[in-house]
Amino acid sequence: NFPRTVMVNLNIHNRNTNTNPKRSSDYYDRSTSPWNLHRNEDPERYPSVIWEAKCRHLGCINADGNVDYHMNSVPIQQEILVLRREPPHSPNSFRLEKILVSVGCTCVTPIVHHVA
Amino acid sequence: NFPRTVMVNLNIHNRNTNTNPKRSSDYYDRSTSPWNLHRNEDPERYPSVIWEAKCRHLGCINADGNVDYHMNSVPIQQEILVLRREPPHSPNSFRLEKILVSVGCTCVTPIVHHVA
């Protein structure tokens, strides 16, 4: 059970001790469903900077390096929690907010066949 | 600038009003780098339940439905913020924690050639 309002220490503890969080930084370019990363900045939010993935192509890259439209590049999305200043510009009062972010892209078999 | 300790309202505001967070729920099965979702539960954490992706294969699924080892299935990871009860079992005192989660998998061209 969680109360409505709690005290939160913002001195972040990083539990990623056994893994390198930068590890997947080149997947955006090597994937068969490559993506670009776009910076989303909002000073009223914590964290203020979030990187969003946007798939480069509708189709997927085949072995020849060409886009194959028999497959689809799609974003993998995740709901994450962020802190939103409430009221706005408040220095030490926040509200939890759930946002949907695109983390990367994957190549899927299409289920809608409406293109020539 | 953010102070060290803040008040947080846990009554979550959901900004995903224009999107369907379930939309990508079938990608795990349709992807050329399919994955399974595993429940990670921790009562000392908020949110207490996080779903983690586990790639099914070493290689990627080709057009014939077989695993192609000329390509690699890899996890797409993201660092997310969660709240950790501090001290443990505390009802209304938390600390921000950064954890690395696997959100899904993507198919990449290999850079490590150590297999026959």
Partner: nanobody, 123 residues
Amino acid sequence: QVQLVESGGGLVQVGGSLRLSCEVSGLPVSSYAMGWFRQAPEKEREFVAAISWIGGDSRYAHFVKGRFTISRDNAKNTVHLQMDSLKPEDTAVYYCNDMPYGLDTRMDEYEYWGLGTQVTVSS
């Protein structure tokens, strides 16, 4: 913290067989592949074989292909390496490890190793 305990090594004659086992605990939820590696005296550690926990598909280094077989027991969090037609050049300490990025994992990315199990092939 991941813990890895390898066993099953020993002294064997050329052409003989051994079955190595690796007990794993503390694996991350997202862990999807396990591998066997080996290190001979005065040589660098090298990849031997890999298997995925879910699909069970496996891959091998060219120098063991057709002689070694990797398998896994999901219920017991254990990975095995059946080694047949052993050669003197298979002499090494054998290690298992979690492969967080599957076949994409680089050798310098393993931060922890078990003690390994010694395999000696005598002629």
